[in-house]
Interface confidence: low
């Protein structure tokens, strides 16, 4: 008996061939001997089966002795043994229809689980193997689960169903809803304008939801909501914003926030959350702000940074074009009785300068100038 695998929703063509290369009488029946279709001369006739409106044949092939049964919009319950009667012969074909669907939705938030469920006919014992867009293979039976989806899991998942040494392939497009970056850090001198950007790693036609930026300033004991906003069809509207600082927000995607000026009291970490309509859970992006200040008070030249710096970052004070006078893995460095000239405060990571602030030290009879 020939075995043919089909996919739910697809079309299958079951073949039946006579030895005579001409149009002769044929019938297709199911295992209950109910006639599905056949011919009466050059006319196609249909029986009382459930397939009635979904069954067809190709009259153009009858003259060559081919009498296919075409079943459109396959259903799992179409799985059956189909019998072609032609020239006093019976050809049996076993059709097994499978379906593979994603748990709820193919648009999932980063960190959520993807469950693929196989629908299969009774009596079958298929195995499934899926390959993710980043090349990860997973195997299973009736259900396959992938926990903690990552951004790289976005794309086409290819799943192969094996039964009776035959296979059928399913392709499922999965969109992982996430920000392009899980975390970002902005380095600014005191007083500079700060731009925070939160680009999304996906595109959808309509994007609706609401979001909020919570901020934990390094100097504050608790976090504070800096801004809340709504997103409607990719248009951003601010719902509320703190008085200090009063952030400004772009009206279009990507989400874009402007802090009028970087101040030590704002240095810290923020968490932007975005709740999308009809989705449980939220998208998150962490953003960090490091602020630098260089000051001269009487005979003391000081450079300080505030915010989440890593222990390997180096803070240095140096006179322009000279060796660093002081260089420490600390958040504040200073030089007593600095000589006149342009001093540079540098925050660097493995030799790469992340932030630089210049301060001009005048001879002792005048006051310092901040360029």
């Amino acid at each position: 008996k020939k075995v043919v695998l089909g996919k739910k929703g697809d079309t299958v063509e079951l073949t039946c061939t006579a030895s005579q290369k001409k149009s002769i009488q044929f019938h297709w029946k199911n295992s209950n001997q109910i006639k599905i279709l056949g011919n009466q001369g050059s006319f196609l006739t249909k029986g009382p089966s459930k397939l009635n409106d979904r069954a067809d044949s190709r009259r153009s092939l009858w003259d060559q002795g081919n009498f296919p049964l075409i079943i459109k919009n396959l259903k799992i319950e179409d799985s059956d043994t189909y019998i072609c009667e032609v020239e006093d012969q019976k050809e049996e074909v076993q059709l097994l229809v499978f379906g593979l669907t994603a748990n709820s939705d193919t648009h999932l938030l980063q960190g959520q689980s993807l469950t693929l469920t196989l629908e299969s006919p009774p009596g079958s014992s298929p195995s499934v193997q899926c390959r993710s867009p980043r090349g990860k293979n997973i195997q299973g039976g009736k259900t396959l689960s992938v926990s903690q989806l990552e951004l790289q899991d976005s794309g086409t998942w290819t799943c192969t169903v094996l039964q009776n040494q035959k296979k059928v392939e399913f392709k499922i497009d999965i969109v992982v809803l996430a920000f392009q970056k899980a975390s970002s850090i902005v380095y600014k001198k005191e007083g500079e304008q700060v731009e925070f950007s939160f680009p999304l790693a996906f595109t959808v036609e309509k994007l609706t939801g609401s979001g909020e930026l919570w901020w934990q300033a390094e100097r504050a004991s608790s976090s504070k909501s800096w801004i809340t906003f709504d997103l409607k069809n990719k248009e951003v509207s601010v719902k509320r914003v703190t008085q200090d600082p009063k952030l400004q927000m772009g009206k279009k995607l990507p989400l874009h926030l402007t802090l009028p000026q970087a101040l030590p009291q704002y240095a810290g970490s923020g968490n932007l959350t975005l709740a999308l309509e009809a989705k449980t859970g939220k998208l998150h992006q962490e953003v960090n702000l490091v602020v630098m200040r260089a000051t001269q008070l009487q005979k003391n030249l000081t450079c300080e940074v505030w915010g989440p710096t890593s222990p390997k970052l180096m803070l240095s004070l140096k006179l322009e074009n000279k060796e660093a006078k002081v260089s420490k893995r600390e958040k504040a460095v200073w030089v007593l009785n600095p000589e006149a000239g342009m001093w540079q405060c540098l925050l660097s990571d493995s030799g790469q300068v992340l932030l630089e602030s210049n301060i001009k030290v005048l001879p002792t009879w005048s006051t310092p100038v901040q360029p």
Epitope: K224, S225, T228, D230, S237, V238, K239, R240, V241, T242, Q243, D244, P245, K246, Q248, P260, Q261
Partner: antibody, heavy 129, light 113 residues
Framework: QVQLVQSGAEVKKPGASVKVSCKAS????????INWVRQAPGQGLEWMGR????????DYAHKFQGRVTMTRDTSTSTVYMELSSLRSEDTAVYYC??????????????????????WGQGTTVTVSS | DIVMTQSPDSLAVSLGERATINCKSS????????????LAWYQQKPGQPPKLLIY???TRESGVPDRFSGSGSGTDFTLTISSLQAEDVAVYYC?????????FGGGTKVEIK
């Protein structure tokens, strides 16, 4: 007492610009947003935008974007609203209005959009050729 | 933008009688986090700037007579003058301050019958 005093009436030609001032007194100028609202003759109220006198940050209604500029001078506690490329339909009374002060902040201390508790007396701007 | 629709456009009420003005917003102005309705009512007399009467939909501004009251939640709101006085003749506006652009209703003119 708390008040907003606006500059006097203006007559302008189409295509010109007008700059209306709003001087605040009786409260901490930098603490509360100043909004601008206009009212065409016999018509309703239309919000144009607002400025945070503390930071200078602005938020303009889409309709006026590109034509309106709101600025402030903290030394004189004055807010300015400049409207350019004037047309006859800009003929209106222009009001500055302060958003309600901190008594109406919510218990968590967050600042929300608020109602307007103090209004200037209004400045009539007539655009005519 | 949130559209504010007021009804009726004008209203004539006898002195001492009740006046009721309705205001409907095109979307809810109730913010669930603090359970507040971002709706205000203003009174404007001829030649004067508007005056704040009610904020948070039902809180009377200090100095406003208690014959003025606000009610409603979500999208439907009402301003009630329980006993109309001669000095209440004015145009009344509702305003949402839930989200920018802040928008006003078209106004309701209250007169004495």
């Amino acid at each position: 007492q708390v008040q907003l005093v606006q500059s006097g009436a203006e007559v302008k030609k189409p295509g010109a610009s007008v700059k209306v001032s709003c001087k605040a007194s009786g409260y901490t100028f930098t603490s509360y947003d100043i909004n601008w609202v206009r009212q065409a003759p016999g018509q309703g109220l239309e919000w144009m935008g607002r400025i945070n006198p503390g930071t200078g940050g602005t938020d303009y209604a889409h309709k006026f974007q590109g034509r309106v500029t709101m600025t402030r001078d903290t030394s004189t506690s004055t807010v300015y609203m400049e409207l350019s490329s004037l047309r006859s339909e800009d003929t209106a009374v222009y009001y500055c209005a302060r958003e309600t002060p901190s008594d109406y902040y919510d218990s968590s201390g967050y600042y929300y959009n608020d109602a307007f508790d103090i209004w200037g007396q209004g400045t009539t701007v007539t655009v005519s050729s | 933008d949130i559209v504010m629709t007021q009804s009726p456009d004008s209203l004539a009420v006898s002195l001492g009688e009740r006046a009721t003005i309705n205001c409907k917003s095109s979307q809810s102005v109730l913010y669930s986090s603090n359970n507040k309705n971002y709706l205000a009512w203003y009174q404007q007399k001829p030649g004067q700037p508007p005056k704040l009467l009610i904020y948070w939909a039902s809180t009377r501004e200090s100095g406003v007579p208690d014959r003025f009251s606000g009610s409603g939640s979500g999208t439907d709101f009402t301003l009630t003058i329980s006993s109309l006085q001669a000095e209440d003749v004015a145009v009344y506006y509702c305003q949402q301050y839930y989200s920018t652009p802040l928008t006003f209703g078209g106004g309701t003119k209250v007169e004495i019958k």
